[in-house]
């Protein structure tokens, strides 16, 4: 009974289409598959950024796979052929591994790369990224930002840079159509007359870096002798009401400070009849139903009641 063997896939490679971290892994079928014409051969692919503890593993019948990587680090991948048990009258047969690696050939010493890169998607409408020049660069150094997400034909360069002392230190992005809930890739590279500049790569999803506007139209309503309802409206803009969490800060007679986090645009506060003054502010953040993370908005304008009995007056800012 001869042992059944199968070769690993051929021409296994990692291809960089210029999408700043979104790479293609591709291969060709193994040699000598003639004996297994009736078989659907599968491939087990493992890949990771070099230094990562864990491999991502997929099993596919295709000859390609695409995924995002951190180009600040190298990438390693390996693949082998799988013959299902149906093809071999017994147990599954695996080939040896074919392996490949890929990394951007980096330039420049670490003091040349940008520092403190920070991107915020204001009100789910306007993306702004800012950075500081590398600690060791001269004023002749300029940085360029490129970005890509699935849906763009190719990586685009920023067209509206924020400048300081003639150097690019940020980018205001144009309207980004259908760009959320998918990886957004950025590369900041640079040029200088006297030294190569280290590129930096960043990946995030836009819905996770949203900073909303603060809530508006804060009001008080007396619900009963010992309850006051605080109300506000969702911030203006495209973010739906179901996507908000709120944090309220309430100050009663300049002493008691109450803070609370709520999901709705109301909050009921227990008070005493002696309450002479009541002030509150609210801020908003995108909640876990719409994103994995987010940034608190600025606080709203303060809304205060003082003097008159709240039962006689409902205040609107």
């Amino acid at each position: 009974d001869t042992e059944i063997k199968v070769n690993p896939p051929q021409d296994f490679e990692i291809v960089d289409p210029g999408y700043l971290g979104y790479l293609y892994l591709q291969w060709q079928p193994p040699l000598s598959l003639d004996h297994f014409k009736e078989c659907t051969v599968e491939y087990e692919l493992k890949y990771r950024n070099i230094g990562s503890e864990t491999w991502k593993t997929i099993i596919t019948k295709n000859l390609h796979y695409k995924d995002g990587f951190d180009l600040n680090k190298g990438i390693e991948a390996k693949i082998h052929t799988l013959l299902p048990w149906q093809c071999t009258n017994g147990s599954e047969v695996q080939s040896s591994w074919a392996e490949t690696t890929y990394w951007i050939s980096p330039q420049g010493i670490p003091e040349t790369k940008v520092q403190d890169m920070d991107c915020v998607y204001y009100n789910w409408q306007y993306l702004l990224c800012s950075w500081k020049p590398g600690i060791g660069v001269l004023l002749d150094t300029n940085y360029n930002l490129f970005y890509w997400y699935e849906g763009l034909d190719h990586a685009l360069q920023c067209v509206d840079y924020i400048k300081a002392d003639g150097q690019n230190i940020g980018c205001r992005f144009p309207y980004l159509e259908a760009s959320d809930y998918k990886d957004f890739y950025i590369c900041v590279n640079g040029s200088s007359e006297n030294k190569p500049i280290r590129s930096s790569y960043f990946t995030f999803q836009l819905q996770n870096i949203v900073k909303p506007l603060p809530p508006v139209y804060l009001t008080f309503t007396r619900e009963s002798s010992c309850e006051i309802k605080l109300k506000w409206s969702i911030p203006l803009g495209p973010i739906p009401a179901r996507c908000f969490d709120y944090e309220i800060e309430i100050r009663e007679d300049d002493t008691t400070l109450v803070t609370a986090t709520v999901e709705n645009e109301t909050y009921t506060l227990k008070t005493t009849n002696e309450t002479r003054q009541l002030c509150f502010v609210v801020r908003s953040k995108v909640n876990i139903y719409c994103s994995d993370d987010g940034i608190w908005s600025e606080w709203s304008d303060k809304q205060c009641w003082e003097g008159e009995d709240l039962s006689k007056k409902t205040l609107l800012r």
Epitope: N49, I50, G108, I109, P110, L139, N194
Partner: antibody
Framework: EVQLQQSGPELVKPGASVKISCKTS????????MHWVKQSHGKSLEWIGI????????NYNQKFKGKATLTVDKSSSTAYMELRSLTSEDSAVYYC???????????WGQGTTLTVSS | DIKMTQSPSSMYASLGERVTITCKAS??????LSWFQQKPGKSPKTLIY???RLVDGVPSRFSGSGSGQDYSLTISSLEYEDMGIYYC?????????FGAGTKLELK
């Protein structure tokens, strides 16, 4: 010829401070950063931090934050490192070192020996 | 911080012998590695940068190789003036970190 000339040996008491200098010549001082490296007796090298003489920007090894302060005097093309609250652990040879455009390090000072002893 | 593990810590070798010193980084450092030689009472001297590029004026018996996390310095035929301590340095990211050193002595 590029030269990095460091100040002479120092003997100081615990708790005191010391300021080591690194006078440069043979190149434009503001066109390259300056790094400082510590070598304890019979031990390896430790990177302390970097300063950009052009704008005074610094980056420190976390281990030396609060211990070392890097400064420059552009007029004399000199870099300085001040070490404070000295203990015997700070006894070492300290080097200034300059990178090239592509790597660390192109030029080194001759080293300054610091001895902390009561 | 990136840890650089250098080996051996010391070694004895004969003149004319081929000598190899290794450095392993705790993560991929993308060939941002320099090798230095230091003699007693002297400042370190750079021999190799970017893992395999020889500094001008350094004898061609010195060579560097490696990628990812693993790097080595080789002296193809040891000469007397090569005695000293050798250090690797990663400069992929701050803080820069050195290996613990390899003391090379004559057998």
């Amino acid at each position: 010829e590029v030269q990095l000339q460091q100040s002479g040996p120092e003997l100081v008491k615990p708790g005191a401070s010391v300021k080591i200098s690194c006078k440069t010549s043979g190149y434009t001082f503001t066109e390259y950063t300056m790094h400082w490296v510590k070598q304890s007796h019979g031990k390896s090298l430790e990177w302390i931090g970097i300063i950009n003489p052009n704008n005074g920007g610094t980056n420190y090894n976390q281990k030396f934050k609060g211990k070392a302060t890097l400064t420059v005097d552009k007029s004399s093309s000199t870099a300085y490192m001040e070490l404070r609250s000295l203990t015997s652990e700070d006894s070492a040879v300290y080097y200034c070192a300059r990178p090239s455009a592509t790597h660390y390090f192109d030029y080194w000072g001759q080293g300054t020996t610091l001895t902390v002893s009561s | 911080d990136i840890k650089m593990t250098q080996s051996p810590s010391s070694m004895y070798a004969s003149l004319g012998e081929r000598v190899t010193i290794t450095c392993k980084a705790s993560q991929d450092i993308k060939s941002y590695l320099s090798w230095f030689q230091q003699k007693p009472g002297k400042s370190p001297k750079t021999l190799i940068y970017r893992a395999n590029r020889l500094v001008d004026g350094v004898p061609s018996r010195f060579s560097g190789s490696g990628s990812g996390q693993d790097y080595s310095l080789t002296i193809s035929s040891l000469e007397y003036e090569d005695m000293g301590i050798y250090y690797c340095l990663q400069y992929d990211e701050f803080p820069l970190t050195f290996g613990a050193g390899t003391k090379l002595e004559l057998k």
